[in-house]
Interface confidence: low
């Protein structure tokens, strides 16, 4: 049965979804267990010109010390104002000094990166040590690079399309996800549904997606259901500022009781099917409908509260 609900983009003042993901357009993770230098390469595309970027390097300490030096190769296509955090990491940074400006002195060894095409940059980096990870990111706002985390099965890194960087790299796109909404025809009342659909990633290991939900309305004003649909290997950790009905695939828990896993359901994996679930749950408004790549953290900010839906 077709559910009549014409999904249209919702104005940003009604709902915004940001997310952190390990999915990259191109990437690779390799193991270089005996290398004295751990090499990471980032190709960053900024389509709208000069940008700000927060780049954090995090070391997984072994016996209290970071055992290897790290070379980070930063290749950018336009001007970047960089906030770098790499506390206590013996870091060498290779970058184009005419394009990258630091928010504060980096306090690390720096090397000028030659103006090479991508393939040659990888070769240049590989001459300095085996590449542990490489990734191509489009318009990142922030990047977290975890050192010593590489668990790839590859012995060398070769860029491949649509890769999951696992725990090695997480990033947040600058552009929020497209949020759509609609009215469910023939359903009375003011119950609203927030639907988040997380698409399958390239690797299918167990994942927890943290979902932060912030709805700006008085607690008594809200009658809402949060529908979370994802691949079977995804479980959910929900951090919500309102009580609402929860309807998920896999298992979920709440941030206040993270140890208590609650079993979810097998939900449809199509937009139409999920709208049908919302209808079955007596929602009259789909206040937000979002489809995302496999993410680690998703933040939903909405101000609908069972009120009138405004689409842009």
């Amino acid at each position: 049965e077709t559910v009549h609900c014409d999904l249209q983009p919702v104005g940003p003042e009604r709902g915004e979804v940001t997310y952190t993901t390990s999915q990259v357009s191109k990437g690779c993770v390799a193991q270089a267990p005996n290398a004295i230098l751990e090499v990471h390469v980032l190709f960053l595309e900024f389509p709208t010109g000069p940008s700000q970027l927060e780049l954090t390097l995090q070391a997984s300490k072994q016996n209290g010390t970071w055992p290897r030096e790290v070379l980070l190769v930063l290749s950018v296509n336009s001007s970047v104002f960089l906030h770098l955090q790499a506390l206590g990491i013996p870091l060498h940074l290779a970058y184009n000094s005419s394009l990258v400006t630091f928010q504060e002195p980096p306090g690390v060894n720096t090397t000028e990166l030659p103006s090479f095409p991508k393939t040659q940059i990888l070769e240049w980096a590989a001459e300095r040590g085996p590449i542990t990870s490489a990734a191509e990111l489009n318009d990142p706002q922030s990047i977290l690079l975890r050192l010593g985390q590489a668990q790839g099965s590859l012995s060398f890194c070769m860029l491949e399309a649509s890769q999951d960087m696992g725990r090695t790299l997480e990033w947040r796109p600058r552009t929020p996800a497209l949020v759509r909404g609609c009215h469910l025809e023939g359903v009375a009342g003011h119950k609203e549904a927030h639907i988040l659909r997380v698409l399958p990633g390239h690797s299918a290991g167990p994942r927890t997606v943290t979902v932060k939900v912030e709805l700006s309305c008085a607690p008594g004003d809200l009658d809402a259901v949060l529908i979370l649909q994802g691949p079977p290997y995804v479980s959910w950790l929900i951090d919500a500022n309102h009580n609402m009905q929860i309807w998920t695939t896999g298992e979920y828990s709440f941030k206040i009781f993270p140890e208590k896993n609650i079993r979810g359901f097998k939900l449809p994996d199509t937009p139409q099917g999920l709208l049908g679930e919302a209808r079955m749950l007596n929602a009259s408004i789909v206040a937000s409908f979002v489809e995302l790549p496999l993410a680690s953290i998703v933040s939903l900010h909405a101000s609908s509260c069972g009120g009138r839906l405004q689409t842009s």
């Epitope: 290997y233 896993n261 609650i262 079993r263 359901f265 097998k266």
Partner: antibody
């Protein structure tokens, strides 16, 4: 149409072993979370074990009463669920149902009777 | 483990009667599922997620409740409704069933 057909039940002595099978059809078996539920004569339902799909790394779960004695497994190429029961006790006497968990146990087999008696 | 206590354990009623079966959990659960079983047959899914009727279940059945108290109601008992009804939760490990409520003909 979803069909679950159990087999392998029978009479066995305490301490003995038995292997139950459940042949599945009418749905994508490899995507399904599959369970065994049992019912002792004249008693209520008791969950025994679950095995999840390949996408969930075929994770397995057991009731305390059978942990260490029973092993759940599956062969997705044969659309078949198994329950290997070792060190059987008289209290394991029951009808064993193969079930599919979706939002709840939405499909059940007809059951196979296991009798543990000397 | 979460214990589910069904009451009454059995009841006698006439066709047309309104029947209510209770399921109380020893601690709060998110959802309750209900199954119907007739003698010598496998259980059938009846109500899922507390209030949703499984496929083919007549609308005279309804489910309600939250927290620790859940109810299955038959608004007007029909001859085919005489059976045993079980509640079940899996909000917390392990999955548990209630002891069952047998609905008999008066």
């Amino acid at each position: 149409e979803v069909q679950l057909v159990e087999s392998g039940g029978g009479l066995v002595k305490p301490g003995g072993s038995l292997r139950l099978s459940c042949a599945a059809s009418g749905f994508t078996f490899s995507d399904a979370w599959m369970d065994w539920v049992r019912q002792a004569p004249g008693k209520g339902l008791e969950w025994v074990s679950e095995i999840r799909s390949k996408a969930s790394n075929h994770a397995t779960y057991y009731a305390e009463s059978v942990k260490g004695r029973f092993t759940i497994s599956r062969d997705d190429s044969k659309n078949t669920l198994y329950l290997q029961m070792n060190s059987l006790k008289t209290e394991d006497t029951a009808v064993y149902y193969c079930t599919r968990w979706r939002r709840f146990f939405d499909s059940w087999g007809q059951g196979t009777l296991v009798t543990v008696s000397s | 483990d979460i214990q589910l206590t069904q009451s009454p354990s059995s009841l006698s009623a006439s066709v047309g009667d309104r029947v209510t079966i209770s399921c109380r959990a020893s601690s709060s659960v998110s959802y309750m599922h209900w199954y119907q079983q007739k003698p010598g047959k496998a259980p059938k899914p009846w109500i899922y997620a507390s209030s949703n009727l499984a496929s083919g279940v007549p609308s005279r059945f309804s489910g309600s409740g939250s927290g620790t108290d859940y109810t299955l109601t038959i608004s007007s008992l029909q001859p085919e409704d005489f059976a045993t009804y079980y509640c079940q939760q899996w909000s917390s490990n392990p999955l548990t069933f209630g002891g069952g409520t047998k609905v008999e003909i008066k």
